[in-house]
């Protein structure tokens, strides 16, 4: 029978380095061959990605049916937009039945200001009790130097620079990996005594230091199963850390509440110069993808009876009769969804005298999500507060307008007596509350 095309089932992780990014794609277990990555050049032509130093792309096979794309920010397929490097790629795979699947398009996006290591998030730092802190650099050290290492700084004299609740990788000038792993890098926390290098288990590759909350591995690139790849002027050293699951065995079966942990580390050096690493990469496994399935997405536009949005006009209440300048309280909602990461963005809202949203005349109410500035009775955006009856405020948008009537274009200043219909174009985005999922309006 015919197969309906479907997007390839894959997980992926993007890591933005200072000079290039790496995009690792892993197809599902049933995949019989690794995915094919394609890209669009600036003429819109499709290219299957391969090792091409002229174009700044390298493809290598990863474990299982995975591939890793590395592309420089000056690659033929990378463009600059809004302080980011952007590269659209396609992931193409074949299922177990070898039927061709349609390409899943993905937009790879890396910030342009990645040359400096970000200072760690304060959440990584504040929650570590002093007794569990693992020194990252000897004291005394300045805050700037400490945070430049990707570590946490406190003004205390002892252990003023310590590792944060994450994975911190340093590639040393002398050719060593230094990998600090926090137990809180996973939830539930890692069993630290089970963390080990995947390819070697001898004592020379054991952790050099450990606390209740951290484990530190330090070993040269020439040991512990480190692999080396040389491409042109670049030498890439890679290794992998894994942890075992805590399994509870019972008389009728065994269970675990731990997810798998695999940490891929990579240090990249220039072969011709004796400089510091040009690339430091940590690849943690991406979190499991949410269970998704196709289904209807239902949106609703309602008019509330008052400013409390306590009750709404029903189908039988329309047309609602209002006096000129009376407020009208409008709500647009996503229905029947419990995903807190969904956000609702109002794009344009407008009014027409007929049910046809494209009919003329029209009056703008919201323009790009913001009140239309050409109106002397400005639309008011109304914040939606979380409540027991409204647990996902990002699924709702509210605004109020002041009642008006359209004017007859043929008879000067004569108000039309007919109804006014409201229309909105909306987007549903995720994750909610992030800049790309929120409209910020100028102060008027």
């Amino acid at each position: 029978g015919q197969h309906k095309p479907e997007a390839p089932d894959y997980s992926s992780v993007l890591h933005c380095g200072p000079w290039s990014f790496q995009f690792a794609v892993n197809l599902n277990q049933e995949a019989t061959s690794p995915p094919v990555l394609i890209a669009w050049d600036n003429q819109g032509l499709l290219h299957e990605l391969q090792n091409d130093s002229d174009c700044g792309t390298w493809i290598r096979k990863g474990p299982g049916s995975s591939v890793v794309l590395e592309a420089t920010y000056s690659s033929c397929y990378v463009t600059e937009w809004d302080s980011h490097y952007i590269m659209p790629v396609g992931v193409e795979g074949a299922g177990a039945a070898e039927h061709k699947v349609v390409t899943e398009r993905k937009l790879l996006k890396c910030p342009m200001d990645l040359l400096a290591r970000d200072a760690p998030d304060t959440d990584w730092c504040d929650s570590i009790p002093a007794r569990d802190r693992l020194p990252c650099a000897p004291s005394p050290i300045s805050r700037g130097d400490c945070e430049g290492l990707g570590c946490c700084y406190s003004s205390e004299e002892v252990n003023s620079c310590y590792y944060g609740n994450t994975v911190t990788l340093h590639c040393t000038r002398e050719g060593h990996f230094s990998i600090a792993v926090s137990r809180n890098v996973t939830s539930p926390p890692l069993l630290l005594d089970s963390v080990r290098l995947a390819l070697r288990n001898d004592s020379a590759c054991n952790p050099v230091m450990a606390t209740q909350a951290f484990v530190l591995f330090q070993f040269p690139f020439t040991s512990c199963g480190t692999t080396r790849q040389i491409t042109g002027d670049r030498a890439v050293y890679e290794n992998e850390l894994v942890a075992t699951r805590d399994v509870k065995n019972g008389s009728r079966g065994s269970v675990t509440r731990d997810s798998i942990f695999r940490l891929h580390v990579s240090c990249s050096y220039s072969v011709s110069s004796n400089s510091l690493p040009i690339n430091v990469q940590v690849f943690t496994l991406p979190p499991p993808f949410p269970e998704t399935q196709p289904g209807p997405l239902t949106l609703e536009l309602q008019i509330a009876k008052d400013k409390n949005y306590g009750s709404y006009y029903g189908v039988g209440d329309y047309p609602v009769v209002k006096l000129l300048r009376d407020p009208i309280y409008v709500e647009v909602s996503i229905l029947h969804r419990t995903d807190p990461y969904l956000g609702l963005l109002l794009q344009q809202c407008w009014a027409t005298p007929s049910t046809d949203p494209l009919s003329q005349p029209q009056w703008p109410i919201l323009v790009k999500g913001c009140p239309y500035i050409g109106d002397n009775y400005q639309t008011q955006l109304i914040p939606v507060q979380k409540a027991l009856d409204l647990p996902f405020p990002s699924h709702h948008q509210r605004f109020s307008i002041f009642t008006f009537s359209f004017v007859n274009p043929t008879v000067e200043k004569q108000a039309l007596r007919g109804p006014v219909h409201l229309h909105c174009s909306v987007s549903v985005c995720q994750p909610a509350e992030t800049p790309s999922c929120v409209v910020t309006c100028p102060d008027l």
Epitope: N308, Y309, P340, Q385, L388, P391, F392
Partner: antibody, heavy 119, light 106 residues
Framework: QVTLKESGPGILKPSQTLSLTCSFS??????????VGWIRQPSGKGLEWLAH???????FYNPSLKSQLTVSKDTSRNQVFLKITSVDTADTATYYC???????????WGQGTTLTVSS | ENVLTQSPAIMSASPGEKVTMTCSAS?????MHWYQQKSSTSPKLWIY???KLASGVPGRFSASGSGNSYSLTISSMEAEDVATYYC?????????FGGGTKLEIK
């Protein structure tokens, strides 16, 4: 099956701090839309909502008591906590914790724990 | 604060009699919820989203309303319905309960 159980000191003196624990099972506070609220009821009187904590750690308090209340949670241990500072005899009541689900306001309640404030 | 006023505060009904109690909100709410509390026990969710019966609630109970005005009705009073009934709004913080209607049997 969903159960909640409150525990507390039973008796306090005025100006002391009340610490209550709600231990629950049958649901997780990491599930989106879930929350736990605290409600109290003086003997023979009505119900008064005190505080509410959501899965995403959003917290809401009764404004008349806000300066005295702190709600927190330990998701991994399935526990929610309420602290009330400088209690008074008027705080003598039965204290309940209750679960709120998506479109299910306080659908499961604990058995309540009684507090007596007396000098 | 949205004040919920229940009336009557106390009422009694004979077995088989129809019972109606009301709850008035100072600000309109999207839904009203109702709890039943029998003496010396925890409250139970009885009706949610204005008119939906919680699990295990007998079909003789119904509720309705919108905006500021809500009511709970028992079509035929039974001895096991003796309790205090509280209305509750979860449409906005602070969450508020009504003062309760104590239902007794004649």
């Amino acid at each position: 099956q969903v159960t909640l159980k409150e525990s507390g000191p039973g008796i306090l003196k005025p100006s002391q701090t009340l610490s209550l624990t709600c231990s629950f099972s049958g649901f997780s506070l990491s599930t989106s839309g879930m929350g736990v609220g605290w409600i109290r009821q003086p003997s023979g009187k009505g119900l008064e909502w005190l505080a509410h904590i959501w899965w995403d750690d959003d917290k809401f308090y009764n404004p008349s008591l806000k300066s005295q209340l702190t709600v927190s949670k330990d998701t991994s241990r399935n526990q929610v906590f309420l602290k009330i500072t400088s209690v008074d005899t008027a705080d003598t009541a039965t204290y309940y914790c209750a679960r709120s689900g998506v479109r299910r306001p306080f659908d499961y309640w604990g058995q309540g724990t009684t507090l007596t404030v007396s000098s | 604060e949205n004040v919920l006023t229940q009336s009557p505060a106390i009422m009694s009904a004979s077995p088989g009699e129809k019972v109606t109690m009301t709850c008035s909100a100072s600000s309109s709410v999207r839904y009203m919820h109702w709890y039943q509390q029998k003496s010396s026990t925890s409250p139970k969710l009885w009706i949610y989203d204005t008119s939906k019966l919680a699990s295990g609630v007998p079909g003789r109970f119904s509720a309705s309303g919108s905006g500021n005005s809500y009511s709970l009705t028992i079509s035929s009073m039974e001895a096991e319905d003796v309790a205090t009934y509280y209305c509750f709004q979860g449409s906005g913080y602070p969450l508020t309960f009504g003062g309760g209607t104590k239902l007794e049997i004649k």
